[in-house]
């Protein structure tokens, strides 16, 4: 803001001179600038208890430039506004107010929320998540072999994090019980994850325990500790179905 204060030289009518310094067009000893040269804005500058006229190339914070034929002035923004484009369009609000469509509000309107960083009213953003990724292989202590009960997991990503008033994200991790493929672990296979076995897909939204296909059960060679009679197998299947569990992690 380039300010110029006037000093009277050539007297016009009482207290008015045109022989002024800097940006003043007319000035007086007592009041400083009375009017400004083209494109400059008149403003009152407080010096102690006194206000004197100055001519500025741009208006200070809290003011905007008004232009009328041959007379420009810095005009105050509204009381709740820090910087403005004109009287009716604020671009930055004072502390405690939120900017919305050029206005400063105590509270944001319905459907919007206050962003305390930008001090603006913004749209409420709800959480968005991706589709579930496929289930991981069924493992027990990192092993994908041996006829034992294990777990499998699937995950999905957060595409859009919610804003303060937005809907929270649903679980992004899901774990369920499953049965490890009935096959003998090879020597170097301990802890090594195998390919995901074939299984029936659970219904959408369900998280059922996986039961091996009859084909895969038949084709796998039994080893002594895994041997069970048909009656025991049947009984176990029923119990496991009742115990089906889904573990979720909420974000």
């Amino acid at each position: 803001q380039n300010a110029s204060r006037g000093r009277r030289q050539r007297r016009m009518h009482p207290n008015v001179s045109q022989g002024c310094q800097g940006g003043c067009a007319t000035c007086s000893d007592y009041n400083g600038c009375l009017s400004c040269k083209p494109r400059l804005f008149f403003a009152l500058e407080r010096i102690g208890m006194k206000q004197i006229g100055v001519c500025l190339s741009s208006c200070p914070s809290g003011y905007y430039g008004t232009r009328y034929p041959d007379i420009n002035k810095c005009t105050k923004c509204k009381a709740d506004c820090d910087t403005c484009f004109n009287k009716n369009f604020c671009t930055k609000c004072k502390s405690g107010f939120y900017l919305h469509l050029g206005k400063c509000l105590d509270n944001c309107p319905e459907g919007l929320e206050a962003n305390n960083h930008t001090m603006e009213c913004v749209s409420i953003v709800h959480c968005e998540v991706s589709e579930w990724n496929p289930w991981s292989p069924c493992t027990k202590k990192g092993k994908t072999c041996g006829f034992k009960r294990g777990t499998e997991t699937r995950v999905r990503e957060i595409i859009q994090h919610p804003s303060a008033k937005g809907n929270l994200c649903p679980p992004t991790n899901e774990t369920r019980k499953c049965t490890v493929q009935r096959k003998k672990c090879q020597k170097g296979e301990r802890g090594k994850k195998g390919r995901e076995r074939k299984r029936k897909k659970p219904n959408k939204g369900e998280s059922k325990e996986a039961i091996p296909d009859s084909k895969s059960l038949e084709s796998s060679k039994e080893i002594p500790e895994q041997r069970e009679n048909k009656q025991q197998q049947k009984k176990r299947k029923v119990q496991d179905k009742q115990k089906s569990v889904s573990v979720s992690t909420v974000h």
């Epitope: 009518h13 007319t26 009375l34 004197i52 034929p69």
Partner: antibody, heavy 119, light 107 residues
Framework: EVQLQESGPSLVKPSQTLSLTCSVT????????WSWIRKFPGNKLEFMGY???????YYIPSLKSRVSITRDTSKNQYYLQLNSVTTEDTATYYC?????????????WGQGTLVTVSS | DIKMTQSPSSMYASLGERVTITCKAS??????LSWFQQKPGKSPKTLIY???RLIDGVPSRFSGSGSGQDYSLTINSLEYEDMGIYYC?????????FGAGTRLEIK
């Protein structure tokens, strides 16, 4: 001492044009802002517009379509024309001047001229 | 347009009395306010500009104050010659606008 003096007809017929002159002495109309103000019978004052030192004009929105302020720098005079007058335009018309925001507004006034709009 | 609400619209006061006339703007006018006195058959005379600056030759019993939207003119000790109509004027924004006036009469 700056002096302003209004002149023109005191009676104008409805739908006609009101024309007034303001003659300025003690200052040049090529400096400052030269205005017309009117005072209605109920004592209400209304600023009508101005002509600037460069000859640019400003008119209040309610009169913009029918008002005109012009000047003759060689005579140091400026003029008011108000078209399509009605009885509502009956008022005392003043010319007045100011030199900018930092000084007194309308520090100098003419004595005023009463214009009656009547058939 | 900025509306200037002036009060009272008329008043009677005794000589030597302290008189206050107020003007309220419809929005903040940032001290761009003048006061005028008009006597019957005369043109208005500027008393005060920029809220509190007295025009040369105006008696010191006249004073102005205010900020934001609220402004006042005070006559400290009323004299007979002070009777007339008083107007406020805002010139913060065009069109500049006057108050409706306060008629001051002596009791």
């Amino acid at each position: 001492e700056v002096q302003l003096q209004e002149s023109g007809p005191s009676l104008v017929k409805p739908s006609q044009t009101l024309s007034l002159t303001c003659s300025v002495t003690g200052d040049s109309i090529t400096s400052g802002y030269w205005s017309w103000i009117r005072k209605f019978p109920g004592n209400k004052l209304e600023f009508m517009g101005y002509i600037s030192f460069s000859g640019k004009t400003y008119y209040i929105p309610s009169l913009k379509s029918r008002v005109s302020i012009t000047r003759d720098t060689s005579k140091n005079q400026y003029y008011l024309q108000l078209n399509s007058v009605t009885t509502e335009d009956t008022a005392t018309y003043y010319c007045a001047t100011y030199h900018g925001y930092g000084g007194p507004w309308f520090a100098y006034w003419g004595q005023g001229t009463l214009v009656t709009v009547s058939s | 347009d900025i509306k200037m609400t002036q009060s009272p619209s008329s008043m009677y006061a005794s000589l030597g009395e302290r008189v206050t006339i107020t003007c309220k703007a419809s929005q903040d006018i940032d001290s761009y306010l003048s006061w005028f006195q008009q006597k019957p058959g005369k043109s208005p005379k500027t008393l005060i500009y920029l809220t509190n600056r007295l025009i040369d030759g105006v008696p010191s019993r006249f004073s102005g104050s205010g900020s934001g939207q609220d402004y006042s003119l005070t006559i400290n000790s009323l004299e007979y010659e002070d009777m007339g109509i008083y107007y406020c004027l805002q010139y913060d924004e065009f069109p500049v606008t006057f108050g409706a006036g306060t008629r001051l009469e002596i009791k």
